[in-house]
Interface confidence: medium
Amino acid sequence: NKILVKQSPMLVAYDNAVNLSCKYSYNLFSREFRASLHKGLDSAVEVCVVYGNYSQQLQVYSKTGFNCDGKLGNESVTFYLQNLYVNQTDIYFCKIEVMYPPPYLDNEKSNGTIIHVKGKHLCPSPLFPGPSKP
């Protein structure tokens, strides 16, 4: 059995920032889970991770240089991305894995959200010299 994920088809980020909400057909309350956001049609870049454990504080991090924060709802995770570059306009996919309690669950691949960055032309960091290619 797979978790279903709903995302907006497109979000426009005028000021290099955007809130992307991932809505799940599953209640995350009192669950240990790992929600992540991935860039590109091939999901090659893991943009941001939200790790939730019923006994600990929410952990939000990016290992790929994105400035991100996360907010947890009962059946959603919202990723707040800041300092996006125009050349990071791409399609972004929500992913969810529930580790506890058993059984392990993950999601059907979602339709993705095109994030259209229309803000200031910031200079990308060395981590992101250009867009990902499928």
Epitope: D90, H116, G130
Partner: antibody, heavy 125, light 107 residues
Framework: EVQLVESGGGLVQPGGSLRLSCAAS????????MSWFRQAPGKGLEWVSV???????YYADSVKGRFTISRHNSKNTLYLQMNSLRSEDTAVYYC???????????????????WGQGTTVTVSS | EIVLTQSPATLSLSPGERATLSCRAS??????LAWYQQKPGQAPRLLIY???NRATGIPARFSGSGSGTDFTLTISSLEPEDFAVYYC?????????FGQGTKVEIK
């Protein structure tokens, strides 16, 4: 006036190459999402490729590895480089602009709002 | 990929009559469906986006409805210039896909 004008079509042998051009006026190609579509004789429309404003490019499975979409910012022109052409690539090719606007956090996508007149590609020996 | 099936393939009507065109998706596309008009030798023209919103400059006789898997384009009173082929297109799932078209011809 906002418009797109395609060129570069013609007759080519199977296995050959062509480069289609799509010159834009009245708006900036590089700040828009631009796609190529095609329409085989007597058939419906098929999406071929897209280039996002950020430069990311994607392709239909039927052309992946053979076609390359690109743009020249100062010439305000979109291109489609077509290699290893097959008879099933015979079609009228259109470039089109994705109509997108909105405010922070909102998406407003309203379909392909500007189309070129089309250029005919015939692949035959 | 999502398959869009349009019906009927051909619609034979007279000017002034009402035209009802159908587009059915193989799975839900929510409201992310557009309609285009194409005349012979011309590029497509956007009529309706997001199922029910008229594009700029499109006359009020064109209207769209539906959500999920079933959509309808209605032309309330056909004008001579409305005889053309109409395509639906979804943007809910990758890749974007079109229906095979409905030809509206003069009876």
């Amino acid at each position: 006036e906002v418009q797109l004008v395609e060129s570069g079509g013609g007759l080519v042998q199977p296995g050959g190459s062509l480069r289609l051009s799509c010159a834009a006026s009245g708006f900036t190609v590089s700040s828009n999402f631009m796609s190529w579509f095609r329409q085989a004789p007597g058939k419906g429309l098929e999406w071929v490729s897209v280039i996002y404003s950020g430069g990311s490019t994607y392709y239909a499975d039927s052309v992946k590895g053979r076609f390359t979409i690109s743009r020249h910012n100062s010439k305000n022109t979109l291109y489609l480089q077509m290699n290893s052409l097959r008879s099933e690539d015979t079609a009228v090719y259109y470039c089109a602009r994705h109509g997108i606007t909105g405010t922070t956090g909102d998406y407003y996508y309203y379909g392909m709002d500007v189309w070129g007149q089309g250029t005919t590609v015939t692949v035959s020996s | 990929e999502i398959v869009l099936t349009q019906s009927p393939a051909t619609l034979s009507l007279s000017p002034g009559e009402r035209a009802t065109l159908s587009c059915r998706a193989s799975q839900s596309v929510r409201s992310y469906l557009a309609w285009y008009q194409q005349k012979p030798g011309q590029a497509p023209r956007l009529l309706i986006y997001d199922a029910s919103n008229r594009a700029t400059g499109i006359p009020a006789r064109f209207s769209g409805s539906g959500s999920g898997t079933d959509f309808t384009l209605t032309i309330s009173s056909l004008e001579p210039e409305d005889f053309a082929v109409y395509y639906c297109q979804q943007r809910s799932n990758w890749p974007p896909t079109f229906g095979q078209g409905t030809k509206v011809e003069i009876k």
